[in-house]
Amino acid sequence: QPSVSPGEPSPPSIHPGKSDLIVRVGDEIRLLCTDPGFVKWTFEILDETNENKQNEWITEKAEATNTGKYTCTNKHGLSNSIYVFVRDPAKLFLVDRSLYGKEDNDTLVRCPLTDPEVTNYSLKGCQGKPLPKDLRFIPDPKAGIMIKSVKRAYHRLCLHCSVDQEGKSVLSEKFILKVRPAFKAVPVVSVSKASYLLREGEEFTVTCTIKDVSSSVYSTWKRENSQTKLQEKYNSWHHGDFNYERQATLTISSARVNDSGVFMCYANNTFGSANVTTTLEVVDKGFINIFPMINTTVFVNDGENVDLIVEYEAFPKPEHQQWIYMNRTFTDKWEDYPKSENESNIRYVSELHLTRLKGTEGGTYTFLVSNSDVNAAIAFNVYVN
């Protein structure tokens, strides 16, 4: 029992005076705590705790479930403990079957023994399957068996605690290990579109896809240079064990010009953070801007060819395009096409191909384009020498 200098408070004294006690099932457990400032006995095993305010703890007929740590505490908060094993051949293990392990950390298979005097207290795979080759464990008859440095590959591993008895293995109930993956890379984030151009009153909706090994990845939409909380909707899926996907959709049901700006989808985990941005431009109404690709005054020799080329920006998309000369519309000799196949493209090209021009074909050639909001035109003055 502990000894301390006089005057100092000392821990309680327990009888029997040993750290471990083994009793047979059905026998009596009698523990005496001697201390003038006795407060209580506490019993602990797995997640169970019991208290007793009597200084003598008596269990008349011991059961396997009385196996555990008995601690006596005094008014100074000092304590002393004894561990009692209740030997029951019919119940060698006490078990708590919940088993979660964080990747790269140790985790405890909680199967303390009711009798420490056993052989080969170990882990075994279910249905005679071997354990993973790299799995290592540390046995502790009072607590269970600690699996060292849990690997992702151990997820859903089925195991038993085991002891050898008379040449045979006695197995506990089965445990299924659930592995919580460690973050070993930043989340992968992507956005449905890098830029949006809308008219006032239209709906803005953008989706950010966040991919990671587990659902504990954090994500949010933020507006740059603003603290305002944005309204998001989430959908999520587990594609297999360590392949989690979340879609965070940001919606502004009726966009205004002052909603224009950069929106960031930000995600982080314990490894680090990642972000992706999208740009919103809201205009009060549609527009068309035309840019001639050649000089609008063209000099050409009789019999020569010339191409009149314009680029134009149109939002919303152009509905009608035409080339006109002397109040007549060209039905052929021209082509109109988007500058890129990009979904958010607003730039287009129109080319009028004039071949073997005659002196009488000089004059004003006009390109007209319109969309649902505006019309625009540009004129080329062609002189044929």
């Epitope: 023994l113 056993v118 170990s122 080759k133 290592r136 540390i138 046995p139 008859p141």
Partner: nanobody, 128 residues
Framework: QVQLVESGGGLVQAGGSLRLSCVAS????????MGWFRQGPGKEREFAAA????????YYADSVKGRFTISRDNAKDTVYLQMNSLKPEDTANYYC?????????????????????WGQGTQVTVSS
């Protein structure tokens, strides 16, 4: 630092018995799991038996189960290996091992990578 010194090896006939002893000095013996490994001629070192610090929970390799018994006396800082029904294939150098946290692998085999201290070994020869 823990020093481990083995003794008790020797020449014995098949079917005979030997008792190996290993005395530890230098640290709290009772906090350590103790065990025995062996290395036969031209073979790799293999686990034979172990006993946890509680002095009650034991481990045996399949090849020695039922024939060898490991025990310890914490008052004497000594671990013993009682070897009965010896066979010629038990011929090996027997090494005492100590670990503060012994790690085991499938089959209750003490993984020698987790051994903290080794003895120099004692030779056991079993003749047929």
């Amino acid at each position: 630092q823990v020093q481990l010194v083995e003794s008790g090896g020797g020449l014995v006939q098949a079917g005979g018995s030997l008792r190996l002893s290993c005395v530890a000095s230098g640290r709290t013996f009772s906090s350590y799991a103790m065990g025995w490994f062996r290395q036969g001629p031209g073979k790799e070192r293999e686990f034979a038996a172990a006993i946890l610090s509680n002095g009650l929970t034991t481990y045996y390799a399949d090849s020695v189960k039922g024939r060898f018994t490991i025990s310890r006396d914490n008052a004497k800082d000594t671990v013993y290996l009682q070897m009965n029904s010896l066979k010629p294939e038990d011929t090996a150098n027997y090494y005492c091992a100590a670990a503060f946290t012994p790690e085991f692998r499938d089959g209750g085999i003490w993984d020698d990578a987790s051994v903290d201290y080794w003895g120099q070994g004692t030779q056991v020869t079993v003749s047929s």
